[in-house]
């Protein structure tokens, strides 16, 4: 679809007159006939296959065409076409004199024509317009001609129809030969596919305008490129959607469970040694000085009793002091100045001379230590009860007590809470998070199967001879006290009496 | 060769929300080159257009309707939906379901049968 | 919001040419589609992109459109062709259809 444009510039008519020779009366009052039709090597008469058009009276004898756009078959003329361009033509155009105003062809003489021209050749699509001038021997005729396409058609021959559009069918203007020019942000076959944030994952990420990035489910980040864990994954990380997979020391479906109590929470104080001991379990080895689950307990340097041979001990800043009894000296008070004729050993120890009397040692009797038999045996100074156990002497022993929850000589070990059987009577322990629970046997119930439910064994009379039945809560059986001259489990034996 | 099915109520009280389902059949709703519509005519009367989808979740809606309309589209079960809130009896109409091809400048070439939805209480 | 506009009803003899037309603003600058629907049925798209015919469409319909006026043109009308015919155009993203015209075959 295109326009054939037709631009007449100045027709010259000098003497006035017809084709005929004879002159217009006053003079020619001229107007134009245009055919156009397809390619003929020698134009004929017939048909005008690609259309006509007429104009007004558009001056008399001589004139200059103005140029006027505002339609009406004025100034240049207009050719539209509806097919494919064929790049050839044919052009007539006469110019008539109008005696009146009817410019209807059977309302005028035939030899009012004034001039006939005819033209045919090769025409290109374009916006230039080619100039011509056709001479005869009275008159010249000047004109510019042109093939445009109309709005919306594009290409060689103005067959491509392509629309400018902004919708979701197309994001596009138009190219000179019709195809498509997406705007900034589009494209695809029709421009309908925005491009997305740059690096925004293909897969994961989609976009509905340009520069955007929306993330499919199980993704997220500006890129759609960072997984979303599993709901409640709290120390864990996903490569796809929806895994929980486990920092460094945690553990459990979520990673919720600190496997690594020591590096998470710091537990021992004053710089002891932390072992990780199970889930949200450990055990601080203390330095020397320091005592308590935590370390938390600074010792007195008193504590470990430095000073013998009774003297008493003063902490200071740097360490300690001891102040020692008469006839001691020395940093622990470990010299004597006394002998044996001095009983200096406590607690029925007995003395014996060393260095011919200059010097003596005391033989302790059990549960006493010292120089001199003073301090009574204390094996709990090395605190050698683990996990806050506590420790007492028991004469020339000691023992640990240990928290719940620990056991062992020092109260080294973890136990669960079903190591100490306490579930009666039979009854099945099971180890829970937060404590136990016993499964019961036939006949007993309560927290600890403590309960007793069954039919007392007595219920059956088992005793004969009018013997005394009772149960027997442990067994779940019964005995029989049997009565003067009976014997056996039931008294059913007679014994013969004296 | 691609067919559409429309799907839901027959009857819907006044107020409550419309839903439909669209079944395509004989080809795929993640093809990039249609977007899939829906249009209803109320009885006696002409086409409206209410909205669409693209394989991707991309909607558009008529202004008209906007804020009573959900379109959504299943890849999976090669479905798309619609959803009409707060309805009343002016939304009394035959629903259709439509393929609208870009490369026919947005033209509808597919078109469900088509599913009477009665607006009364 | 954008209007297109049709003539309730168009007649035409069997054998004649039938034209309905369809307006709106600008009309020529968008893409129009021309959609046939007969009692009871679904609509058939006839015309899209202006003048362009489905396959298995017959040759007697065409389309125009410029200016602010499509229009949909049947020549040699059949009785079969009596249906009522819709103008649809895009709007922005808005899909726009005419009130339809209902073709009568004489």
């Known amino acids: 679809s295109g326009v054939f444009q037709l631009q007449l510039q100045e027709f010259i008519n000098e003497r006035g007159v017809l084709a005929s020779g004879r002159p217009c009366e006053p003079g020619c009052r001229t107007f134009f006939r245009v055919c156009l039709k397809h390619f003929q090597a020698v134009v004929s008469p017939g048909p005008c296959t690609f259309g006509t058009v007429s104009t007004p009276v558009l001056g008399t004898n001589s004139f200059a065409v103005r140029d006027d756009s505002s339609g009406g078959g004025r100034n240049p003329l207009q050719l539209p076409f509806n097919f494919t361009w064929p790049g050839t033509f044919s052009l007539i155009i006469e110019a008539w004199h109008a005696p009146g105003d009817d410019l209807r062809p059977e309302a005028l003489p035939p030899d009012a024509l004034i001039s006939k021209i005819a033209i045919q050749g090769s025409l290109a699509v374009g916006q230039n317009w080619l100039l011509d001038e056709q001479t005869s021997t009275l008159t010249r005729l000047r004109y510019s001609y042109r093939v445009i396409c109309s709005d919306n058609y594009y290409g060689d021959n103005c067959s491509r129809l392509c629309k400018k559009r902004n919708d979701h069918f197309g994001h596009y203007v138009c190219q000179p030969d019709g195809n498509l020019s997406c705007l900034p942000g589009w494209t695809g076959e029709y421009c309908q596919q925005p491009i997305c944030l740059s690096g925004c994952h293909e897969q994961n990420g989609y976009c509905s305008k340009p520069a955007e990035c929306l993330c499919r489910p199980g993704w997220q980040g500006r890129l759609c490129n960072e997984c979303i864990p599993h709901n409640g994954c709290r120390h864990g990380t996903c490569s796809t959607p929806w895994q929980c997979t486990c920092d460094e020391g945690w553990g459990g479906l979520f990673c919720d469970q600190d496997l690594n109590y020591c590096t998470h929470h710091s537990p021992c104080k004053n710089g002891a040694t932390c072992s990780n001991s199970g889930q949200r379990s450990y055990t601080c080895t203390c330095r020397p000085g320091y005592t308590g689950v935590d370390c938390e307990l600074e010792l007195s340097e008193c504590d470990s009793n430095p000073c013998r041979n009774g003297g008493s001990c003063k902490d200071q800043e740097d360490g300690y002091h001891c102040l020692c009894p008469p006839g001691y000296y020395g940093l622990h008070c470990e010299h004597s100045t006394l002998s044996c004729a001095d009983s200096p050993c406590f607690n029925g120890g007995s003395c014996r001379e060393r260095n011919q009397g200059a010097n003596y040692a005391c033989e302790c009797p059990p549960n006493f230590t010292g120089s001199n038999c003073e301090k009574k045996v204390d094996r709990c100074t090395s605190n050698p009860c683990a996990n806050g156990g506590q420790c007492l002497n028991r004469g020339p022993s000691r023992m640990c007590r240990c928290r719940p929850g620990f056991t062992g000589t020092y109260c080294e070990l973890h136990v669960s809470d079903c190591a100490r059987n306490p579930c009666a009577h039979g009854g099945t322990c099971h180890d829970l998070e937060n404590g136990l629970m016993c499964t019961c046997p036939a006949g007993f119930s309560g927290r600890r199967c403590e309960v007793r439910t069954s039919i007392d064994a007595c219920a059956s009379s088992p005793c004969f001879n009018r013997a005394t039945c009772y149960t027997d809560l442990s067994t779940d059986t019964f005995v029989c006290n049997c009565p003067y001259g009976f014997v056996g489990s039931r008294c059913e034996f007679p014994v013969g009496l004296p | 060769e691609v067919q559409l099915q429309e799907s839901g109520p027959g009857l819907v009280k006044p107020s409550e929300t419309l839903s439909l389902t669209c079944t395509v059949s004989g080809g795929s709703i993640s093809s990039s080159s249609y977007y899939w519509g829906w249009i209803r005519q109320p009885p006696g009367k002409g086409l409206e257009w209410i909205g669409d989808i693209y394989y991707t979740g991309s909607t558009y809606y008529n202004p008209s309707l906007k804020s009573r309309v959900t379109i959504s589209v299943d890849t999976s079960k090669n479905q798309f939906s619609l959803k009409l809130s707060s309805v009343t009896a002016a939304d009394t109409a035959v629903y259709y379901c439509?393929?609208?091809?870009?490369?026919?400048?947005?033209?509808?070439?597919?078109w469900g049968q088509g599913t009477l939805v009665t607006v009364s209480s | 919001s954008y209007e297109l506009t049709q003539p309730p009803s168009v007649s035409v003899s069997p054998g004649q040419t039938a034209s309905i037309t369809c307006s709106g603003q600008r009309l020529g600058d968008k893409y129009a589609s021309w959609y046939q629907q007969k009692p009871g049925q679904s609509p058939v798209l006839v015309i899209y992109e202006d003048s362009k015919r489905p396959s298995g469409i017959p040759e007697r319909f065409s389309g125009s459109n410029s200016g602010d006026t499509a229009t949909l043109t049947i020549s040699g009308t059949q009785p079969m062709d009596e249906a009522d015919y819709y103008c649809q155009a895009w709007d922005r993203d808005t899909g726009v259809f005419g009130g339809g015209t209902k073709l009568t075959v004489l």
């Open positions: 439509a393929r609208q091809a870009l490369a026919l400048g947005g033209g509808s070439d597919k």
